[in-house]
């Protein structure tokens, strides 16, 4: 006859492991008993359990409550056992020794491998600001046994570097993602992907990138100077900029205080019916925690009567 087992049995931490041992006998052979022992190199054999064809299962005190036979129906030639709730300390070599009648004893060894799935963590780097050089965007760490694989999934251009630390029964892997911050990266996902044989599927942790920036400011509303004449209603100036975090706006007049009746509404400066006293230099001040920008424009409120007089003069001059 011959003894069938596996070279390696792999189990995830906390789960149950089936340790196979099956005797395929020649004609009429019977299995009397099966003895299971832990047989790591350099240490004496430690008995797990004894399966007797007549007296059933006897589990050694060290494994009490943790070793069982598979449920029936069970082939009488099957000496497999179930090791409940595998822990890392269970990793090692096991031997199954089968006593048969009349062929004698057979033995086989297997290695139990206990997988410790990782619990990955992602740590964002320092605040990202446009204009910085190569900067740490995030680091991702995962510890397990065997060492997990840590990669990145993103549309963002960057560089990665990994390092690992070996512990007695596991390994920690840290991967860093570096990039040169630009405003186009704002809101883009950066995903750490952790692979491990103890995971049914890859674990993914996503970090959304925030890049601080402030665009140049500009003022809209003066595109047609001829609209800025005395008596015009609804005239307004709008300050244009964008940034992360979203900027705040402030309006001032360079050559004095804002005229009465002028309304400041965030990025917009609203004027009452225009008079010549609204002429002047207006400054839009844009700022966020990252930077500040200014844009200034000159408002020249036209007097239509003066204009028509000039036009007549010009005509008559010709």
């Amino acid at each position: 006859g011959e003894l069938e087992t596996s070279d390696v049995v792999t189990v995830v931490l906390g789960q149950d492991a089936k340790l196979p041992c099956f005797y395929r006998g020649d004609s009429g052979e019977q299995v009397g008993q099966v003895a299971w022992a832990r047989v790591d190199a350099g240490e004496g054999a430690q008995e797990l359990a004894l399966l007797h064809s007549k007296y059933g299962l006897h589990v050694s005190p060290a494994y009490e409550g943790r070793v069982e036979q598979p449920p029936p129906p069970r082939n009488p030639l099957d000496g497999s056992v179930l090791l409940r709730n595998a822990v890392q300390a269970d990793e090692g070599e096991y031997e199954c020794r089968v006593s048969t009648f009349p062929a004698g004893s057979f033995q086989a060894r297997l290695r139990l491998r206990v997988l410790v799935p990782p619990l990955p963590s992602l740590n964002p780097g320092p605040a990202l600001e446009e204009g910085q050089g190569l900067t740490l965007a995030a680091s991702c760490t995962a510890e397990g046994s065997p060492a997990p694989s840590v990669t990145w999934d993103t549309e963002v251009k960057g560089t990665t570097s990994s390092r690992s630390f070996k512990h007695s029964r596991s390994a920690a892997v840290t991967s860093e993602f570096h990039l040169v911050p630009s405003r186009s990266m704002n809101g883009q996902p950066l995903t750490c992907v952790v692979s491990h044989p103890g995971l049914l599927q890859d674990q993914r942790i996503t970090h959304i990138l925030h890049v601080s920036f402030l665009a140049e400011a500009s003022v809209r509303g003066l595109e047609d100077q001829n609209l800025w004449h005395i008596g015009r209603e609804g005239a307004m100036l709008k300050c244009l900029s964008e940034g992360q975090p979203p900027p705040s706006y402030n309006w001032t007049r360079l050559d004095g205080p804002l005229p009465s009746g002028v309304r400041v509404d965030g990025d917009t400066l609203g004027f009452p019916p225009l008079t010549t006293e609204h002429s002047g230099i207006y400054v839009c001040h844009v700022s966020n925690e990252f930077s500040s920008r200014d844009s200034q424009v000159t408002v020249d409120v036209l007097d239509p009567q003066e204009d028509s007089g000039k036009q007549v003069d010009l005509v008559s001059a010709s």
Partner: antibody, heavy 118, light 107 residues
Framework: QVQLKQSGPGLVQPSQSLSITCTVS????????VNWVRQPPGKGLEWLGV???????DYNAAFISRLSISKDISKSQVFFKMNSLQADDTAKYYC????????????WGQGTSVTVSS | DIQMTQSPASLSVSVGETVTITCRAS??????LAWYQQKQGKSPQLLVY???NLADGVPSRFSGSGSGTQYSLKINSLQSEDFGTYWC?????????FGGGTKLEIK
């Protein structure tokens, strides 16, 4: 080569017993167990029981009270007997050898079609 | 009883394509699972035992995988002779139940 040949009646009266013989060749019943499985017309497979190489038996818990499996090693025969048949026991009955580590059926008989009807 | 949920119940596939049939057990069956093929009017034939081991004489385009409660049978480069019904069966606790079957038809 390994073969399992079945013989048995095609028609059984309600409440009567069904007996099927599975004669094997190409292997010894002292080395391998034999399972019994049935399949109602157009339906799925249902495991009924097994007799192991050493002679011990295991039955599907739902059939334990009316099922008996035995063997005659010298004749290379396995005997299947089910009592108190009803119309819903109408099925094709198969014997199948246990293979590999004992937990698979690697060779099957041709099947015996059984109709339970008066 | 351990329930074996097999999917899909049926599928129609062209020759040369790849097919995957899955079987989910209601509890851990420790890879004690076999796959069979059955053609119309014939007895089942063993394809895979112990969840991943190919039975003798079975073409290498068949492969079994899985552990715990999730198992699958994959057929690469489907051949015309692969049509029929496929069954999974567990061997962990009484009774040893079969899945509901997957009828594979060739387009």
């Amino acid at each position: 080569q390994v073969q399992l040949k079945q013989s048995g009646p095609g028609l059984v009266q309600p409440s009567q017993s069904l007996s099927i013989t599975c004669t094997v060749s190409g292997f010894s019943l002292t080395n391998y167990g034999v399972n019994w499985v049935r399949q109602p017309p157009g339906k799925g497979l249902e495991w009924l029981g097994v007799i192991w190489s050493g002679g011990s038996t295991d039955y599907n818990a739902a059939f334990i009270s009316r099922l008996s499996i035995s063997k005659d090693i010298s004749k290379s025969q396995v005997f299947f007997k089910m009592n108190s048949l009803q119309a819903d026991d109408t099925a094709k009955y198969y014997c199948a050898r246990e293979g590999y580590d004992g937990y698979a059926m690697d060779y099957w008989g041709q099947g015996t079609s059984v109709t339970v009807s008066s | 009883d351990i329930q074996m949920t097999q999917s899909p119940a049926s599928l129609s596939v062209s020759v040369g394509e790849t097919v995957t049939i899955t079987c989910r057990a209601s509890e851990n069956i420790f890879s004690s699972l076999a796959w069979y093929q059955q053609k119309q009017g014939k007895s089942p034939q063993l394809l895979v035992y112990g969840a991943t081991n190919l039975a003798d004489g079975v073409p290498s385009r068949f492969s079994g995988s899985g552990s715990g409660t999730q198992y699958s049978l994959k057929i690469n480069s489907l051949q015309s002779e692969d049509f029929g019904t496929y069954w999974c069966q567990h061997f962990w606790g009484n009774p040893w139940t079969f899945g509901g079957g997957t009828k594979l038809e060739i387009k």
